[in-house]
Interface confidence: low
């Protein structure tokens, strides 16, 4: 079946960009003018999970690369990594669990809650070019809302 | 609030075009998938093919691939749908209507119609 | 294509009544099922997406259900307004299909 997807940007509230650091990690920072050229574009899956009025199922994918966001244990704490696959078999509607991420919105703002980790959160700390990860707090000194450009 | 407002009826010789339009307002168009669906006089409905006007994302009815072309344009919150070489067959009351990116939304706001015949 | 069956093609029920409406699917649709209801010469109107979810404003009397491939939708009481055709829709898999159609018709 279908898996439908829409290219797009992510944010935190502080308005600090999301940047590839390394080969499997991102960083968020702030960015300007020609640097913005520099964030990630994610293609965002609508794939299956748990329904709720308020919770959407998404997997997040990097736009043109083989890479998915993807929660895993790692030390028994629930790690957010960036996960290589097949891309043959990639996006796909029934992604697995570590894939899916519940997409909330509230006042139009973005949450994105692990499927796999419940109240684990993608996450970026209040300081600058730290990495993304996976956060067990909302309401905290590390932000969970994002707000999302659309790309063409 | 929500409002897809479609061109008006047209009559059209066999082998000719026609491009209907949809309108959008009340919402970001860029944002939500714009469908197209066809209902043949005491027909059913039947699904054309459907647009996401943001990055130009189109999938068609197989059916309709060759018959029916889809497109938008985000500086006017517009989205058309061109039907060639048209045949009897083709007359029917041609539909637009907007889902929600999340997917399991379902078709939630809908166009009046276009009244497209084809006659001779 | 998923084939979606629907049935009854055509019924009469009295006011009051509560009424339900079957489609039924030849495939896996993972609960990707809507209901419309259109009225002559008018253009279809959402009532239910994802099997069971309402759209805003429409009446608590509508409810749907599932069951493996066979959905369901009941009016619970049927009022005068509700006469009209009704369809299904699935949108799991391209080309997304519609059912034949239900023409409700007050007794």
């Known amino acids: 079946a279908p898996v439908r997807s829409l290219h797009c940007t992510l944010r935190d509230a502080q308005l600090k960009s999301l940047v590839m650091s390394g080969p499997y990690e991102l960083k968020a920072l702030h960015l300007q003018g020609q640097d913005l050229e520099q964030q990630v574009v994610f293609s965002m899956s609508f794939v299956q999970g748990e329904e709720s009025n308020d919770k959407i199922p998404v997997a997040l994918g990097l736009k043109a690369k083989n890479l998915y966001l993807s929660c895993v244990l790692k030390d028994d704490k629930p790690t957010l990594q960036l996960e290589s696959v097949d891309p043959k078999n990639y996006p796909k509607k029934k992604m697995e669990k570590r894939f899916v991420f519940n997409k909330i919105e509230i006042n139009n703002k973005l949450e994105f809650e692990s499927a796999q980790f419940p109240n684990w959160y993608i996450s970026t700390s209040q300081a600058e070019s730290m990495p993304v990860f996976l956060g067990g707090t909302r309401g905290g000194q590390d932000i969970t809302d994002f707000t999302m450009q659309f790309v063409s | 609030q929500v409002q897809l407002v479609q061109s008006g009826a047209e009559v059209k010789k066999p082998g000719a075009s026609v491009k209907v339009s949809c309108k959008v307002s009340?919402?970001?168009?860029?944002?939500?998938?714009i469908e197209w669906v066809r209902q043949a006089p005491g027909k059913g409905l039947e699904w054309i093919g459907e647009?996401?006007?943001?990055?130009?994302?189109?999938n068609y009815n197989e059916k309709f691939k060759g018959k029916a072309t889809i497109t938008a344009d985000t500086s006017t919150d517009t989205a058309y749908m061109e039907l060639s070489s048209l045949r009897s067959e083709d007359t029917a009351v041609y539909y637009c209507?907007?889902?929600?990116?999340?997917?399991?939304?379902?078709?939630?706001?809908w166009g009046q119609g276009t009244l497209v015949t084809v006659s001779a | 294509d998923i084939k979606m069956t629907q049935s009854p093609s055509s019924m009469y029920a009295s006011l009051g009544e509560r009424v339900t409406i079957t489609c039924k699917a030849s495939?896996?649709?993972?609960?990707?099922l809507s209901w419309f209801q259109q009225k002559p010469g008018k253009s279809p109107k959402t009532l239910i997406y994802?099997?069971?979810r309402l759209v805003d404003g429409v009446p608590s009397r509508f409810s749907g259900s599932a069951s493996g491939q066979d959905y369901s939708l009941t009016i619970s009481s049927l009022q005068y307004e509700d006469m009209g055709i009704y369809y299904c829709?699935?949108?799991?898999?391209?080309?997304?299909?519609f059912g034949g159609g239900t023409k409700l018709e007050i007794k």
């Open positions: 209507s907007t889902i929600y990116y999340d997917y399991d939304q379902g078709f939630t706001y």
């Open positions: 495939q896996d649709i993972d609960r990707y």
């Open positions: 009340g919402y970001t168009f860029s944002r939500y998938w």
């Open positions: 647009i996401l006007p943001g990055n130009g994302n189109i």
């Open positions: 829709l699935q949108y799991d898999e391209f080309p997304y299909t």
């Open positions: 994802r099997v069971k």
